[in-house]
């Protein structure tokens, strides 16, 4: 009979063991495990009658097609086989165990005892069929295994092989190299890769094998298992597989589409081609006179595009349009986008106008062209280079005129400072019991009138100021502060200002430049209850031109000394020029003695100490500030006067030969003008140097050269 | 002709504030300076601060300074004055002038009452 | 601060009588550079605003009766009304703008 056995484990005996066995039986036990696992099969007790190749009593142990052994007797002869401590393995999950006896025994034999149990197969070591091992990764667990794929790589539906994903590649260059996967290394099993090749519509793909060809093949049938087949519009090439690449392919089409399908087996190498794009040819070119065509080929093709470009010196011109290069390319049809453009010589055209100054043609027939030369220069005497430019602009390759130091920027005539077109006398009376100025004598003198139409009733007065450049007038602060009923400083409105230049004599006012003020600036510390700061600006409508009786005074370095002690300036103004007046009958006579003729006077810089004292010595505040300096003289009668306000006094610079505005007319008092130990008191211009170029939006170094050349 | 108009009467609980307002016309608003002044029932007059509307330059009486807010919107010519933190002795009317002082505002009432 | 005193509180003057106001600065009200001294007189009259009579101690202010002038310097300020009209009865103030500003406490004007 037969015994159907299907646990893990368990025991077998030989029927009425441990007693003998009877004659003329046969049992059969079939042992069935899980899938995964193998049966083991071991004797602790064997003993069986003997006989020549076990023909009487055996156990015999067999899977479904296959004896794994037959014993029998007690001990292994020759002949005969007893188990003894082998153990019996099954191939697979099933096992057979037939125990025999015959009709006779010679003795009492005690049969047998075995045991058996599942033990797990490992598969990853045991599989050496391709079909059923794992491509990658093998991953063993009792009762079973499991496959993985290395990085890149996913598992087939068949749970063994190892495939890509490569349906998705696009290519779009000119040219490209396309290889199977992982190339020169065995490509992936179970996969199906597509490539397509999408060109610009004119362009034919044309497809060239390189190195090694390696797909899987068969003797007698074409590319059963893997193959390459070419896709170009209705038309396949291929299948192509085996050691030998195509031939060259010229698929005279834009778009390509590759195939590649492996299977679930082999190990070949793979594939590599190259692919160019190839287009109608266009005609040869020729470049232009005094120009070339980059780049420079023998043959040009679909796409192709050329730059012409000229020497320098000449531009591109191209339908009467001027540009650097021109682009044309080779269309599909095989022609060019364009004709060849022509070069031509630039022209920098007529040079632009220089304010203050006039151009001069280096070059004959006062040519424009490139590498002509003009020269700038400034109106002389009265406006000067900055820098001490050359003034001399070529013709540059880019069409514009170029100086070596300033480039296409134009240079600048800058008013010259400082120097009267009549020089000063030595011998100089007072603005006290004055002396006439000689027109030119203080060509930056200017009169600046203030009618002050916001007060009721309209307010009317005057002061000096001092011409810095064509647009600016350096004067007091308190000259441009609105009359106010209280100490708080705001400027009088610009409209309400008129600054006269070139003005000699105030009865006559028709040779002189008057101009309206776009700003005004006081310095915004201004104090009017110490006159501290006492420094302004006003900004002029219109640049005034300058002449011999217009011209700037030139400022000074910034140095907080100020001018040396008994160092001599001079100061010229329209004030009050009759020592007999007194402050209080100006004031209440308002302009009537202004000065008709412009007064001037040399004043001697007081030190700064005794100035100090002579004014902490009287009653009120007269506090003299580091941003003042005192002239005049000790026993009186030279002196500046009420009106004079905000004029210059300027000192003669040996180092650069030209009149300094050191100080601004500011106070002076409470005794009358010119009384004896009564000095006036002046704005130290040098304190302010910075503040006026900030102001007036210049950079101090364009001033610098002016007072140190 | 130049004129300042100030804005309503207002009435106001403890701790609030009040913004008055004054409206330049007749004159340019930028060229001169904008004053407030107060006055308390039967008292006399108090300075409380001054603004240039060309530059927005503020000068406050210390008393003021850190409740008084004085400002000017160029574009419609009106100058405001904002008074914080208001306690019952702030009850006053309420006065800005300009051109110093030669022309003045109605005045306006401002009541501080719980 | 400049602190301002006026004298007297209150003043009782027969029509066309002789009134006269003084006020006193804490410090002096004369800026030397300018010469001028920073004092102005108000009048003010019940439910009005105030009106500028008198700036820099002494100038009238256009529209001003003559009857109404100042004087004084540094810190010793006088207005004086020289023949009070009926219509002068008001309450007057002196303000100093020498450094910000600041009111007197006024006097008041009336007719005796």
């Known amino acids: 009979h037969t015994v159907e056995l299907n646990n893990m484990f368990g025991q077998i005996q030989s029927p009425g063991y441990p007693d003998s066995y009877p004659s003329d039986s046969e049992v059969t036990w079939n042992i069935t495990v899980p899938d995964g696992f193998r049966i083991k099969l071991y004797f602790m007790h064997f003993n069986l009658e003997s006989s020549y190749l076990c023909e009487y009593d055996y156990v015999k142990v067999e899977t479904e097609d296959q004896v794994l052994a037959t014993f029998c007797g007690r001990e292994t002869t020759d002949t005969e086989q007893t188990p003894g401590q082998e153990v019996v393995l099954s191939p697979g999950s099933f096992m057979s165990i037939t125990f025999r006896s015959d009709f006779s025994n010679e003795e009492r034999f005690t049969g047998f005892d075995a045991h058996y149990m599942a033990v797990d197969v490992d598969e990853c070591k045991e599989r050496e069929d391709e079909e059923l091992s794992c491509d990658h990764y093998c991953h063993n667990y009792i009762g079973g295994y499991y496959c993985s794929c290395r990085f890149g790589y996913i598992l087939h539906t068949d749970n063994r092989t190892c495939r890509v994903e490569c349906s998705d590649n696009l290519f779009t260059q000119r040219t490209g190299v396309i290889t199977s996967p992982d190339f020169p290394n065995p490509y992936p099993k179970s996969s199906e890769c597509l490539y397509t090749i999408e060109l610009e519509e004119g362009f034919m793909v044309n497809l060239q094998f390189e190195d090694i060809f390696d797909i899987e093949d068969h003797p007698e049938v074409p590319c059963p298992y893997d193959y390459i087949k070419i896709k170009v519009g209705p038309k396949v090439l291929g299948p192509f597989c085996g050691e030998k690449a195509p031939e060259p392919i010229s698929t005279q089409s834009h778009s390509v589409l590759i195939l590649f399908h492996s299977d679930n087996s082999g190990e070949n190498r793979g594939w590599r081609l190259s692919y160019r794009a190839a287009g109608n040819e266009c005609p040869e070119l020729q470049p232009p006179v005094h120009g070339k065509i980059e780049p420079s080929q023998a043959k040009y093709f679909f796409k192709d595009q050329v730059l012409v470009s000229c020497d320098t010196g000449y531009k591109v011109l191209k339908d009467n349009v001027e540009m650097d290069t021109f682009q044309i390319e080779c269309l599909k049809d095989g022609t060019w986008s364009n004709k060849i453009p022509t070069c031509k010589i630039v022209d920098c055209r007529a040079p632009g106008e220089l304010e203050h100054g006039l151009i001069t043609f280096s070059t004959r027939n006062n040519l424009t062209t490139y590498k002509s030369e003009i020269k700038y220069s400034c109106q002389e005497p009265y406006y000067k280079m900055l820098n001490n430019n050359t003034g001399i602009y070529t013709c540059s390759a880019q069409g514009v005129w170029m100086n070596k130091v300033l480039g296409r920027s134009l240079p600048t005539c800058l008013p010259e400072c400082g120097q009267p077109s009549r020089s000063l006398p030595s011998l100089v009376k007072r603005i006290i019991g004055g002396r006439n100025a000689e027109p030119g004598l203080f060509p930056w003198q200017a009169l600046i009138v203030v009618e002050d139409t916001s007060r009721v009733p309209n307010d009317k007065w005057f002061g000096s100021g001092a011409l810095l450049s064509a647009s600016w007038i350096l004067t007091a602060a308190h000259v441009l502060r609105s009359q106010r009923r209280d100490t708080t400083v705001i400027p009088v409105s610009k409209e309400h200002v008129t600054v006269y230049l070139g003005l000699h004599d105030v009865r006559d006012k028709s040779g002189a430049v008057n101009s309206s003020a776009a700003r005004v600036v006081l310095h915004p510390d201004f104090n009017i209850q110490n006159y501290n700061h006492d420094i302004a600006l006003v900004q002029l409508q219109e640049p005034v031109p300058l002449g011999p009786h217009v011209m700037p005074v030139c400022l000074p370095r910034l140095e907080p000394e100020g001018p040396a002690p008994h160092m001599l300036g001079l100061v010229a103004g329209w004030g009050i020029s009759n020592p007999n007046v007194t402050v209080d009958e100006i004031i209440s006579s308002g302009t009537r003695t202004l000065s008709d003729v412009l007064q001037y006077v040399k004043l001697p810089v007081v030190p700064h100490a005794e100035c100090k004292t002579s004014y902490e010595s009287r009653s009120g505040n007269y506090s003299v500030t580091e941003n003042m300096f005192c002239a005049g003289y000790y026993e009186g009668g030279k002196d500046t006067c009420l009106g004079d306000s905000g004029g210059a006094f300027v000192i003669f610079d040996d180092l650069s030969q030209r009149w300094v505005v050191q100080g601004l007319v500011s106070w002076g008092g409470p005794e009358e003008c010119g009384s004896k130990q009564v000095y006036g008191v002046y704005t130290k211009v040098s304190n302010y140097v910075d503040w006026v170029w900030e102001q007036m939006g210049l950079p101090q170094s364009v001033v610098e050269p002016q007072v140190e050349r | 002709q130049v004129q300042l108009v100030q804005s309503g009467a207002e009435v106001k609980k403890p701790g609030a504030s009040v913004k008055v307002s004054c409206k330049a016309s007749g004159y340019t608003f930028t060229t001169d300076d904008i004053n407030w002044v107060r006055q308390a029932p039967g008292q006399g007059l108090e300075w409380i601060g001054w603004i240039y509307p060309r530059d927005d330059r503020t000068k406050y009486n210390d008393k003021f300074k850190d409740r008084a807010t004085l400002t000017v919107d160029t574009s419609s010519n009106t100058a405001y004055m904002e008074l914080s933190s208001l306690r019952s002795e702030d009850t006053a009317v309420y006065y800005c002038s300009s051109l110093e002082d030669t022309y003045w505002g109605q005045g306006t009432l401002v009541t501080v009452s719980s | 601060d400049i602190v301002m005193t006026q004298s007297p509180d209150s003043l009782a003057v027969s029509l066309g009588e002789r009134a006269t106001i003084n006020c006193k600065s804490s410090?002096?009200?004369?800026?030397?550079?300018?010469?001028?001294?920073?004092l102005a007189w108000y009048q003010q009259k019940p439910g009005q605003p105030p009106k500028l009579l008198i700036y820099w101690a002494s100038t009238r202010e256009s529209g001003v009766p003559d009857r109404f002038s100042g004087s004084g310097s540094g810190t010793d300020f006088t207005l004086t009304i020289s023949s009070l009209q009926a219509e002068d009865v008001a309450v007057y103030y002196c303000k100093q703008s020498y450094n910000l500003y600041t009111f007197g406490q006024g006097t008041k004007v009336e007719i005796k």
């Open positions: 410090q002096s009200l004369l800026a030397s550079r300018t010469r001028k001294n920073y």
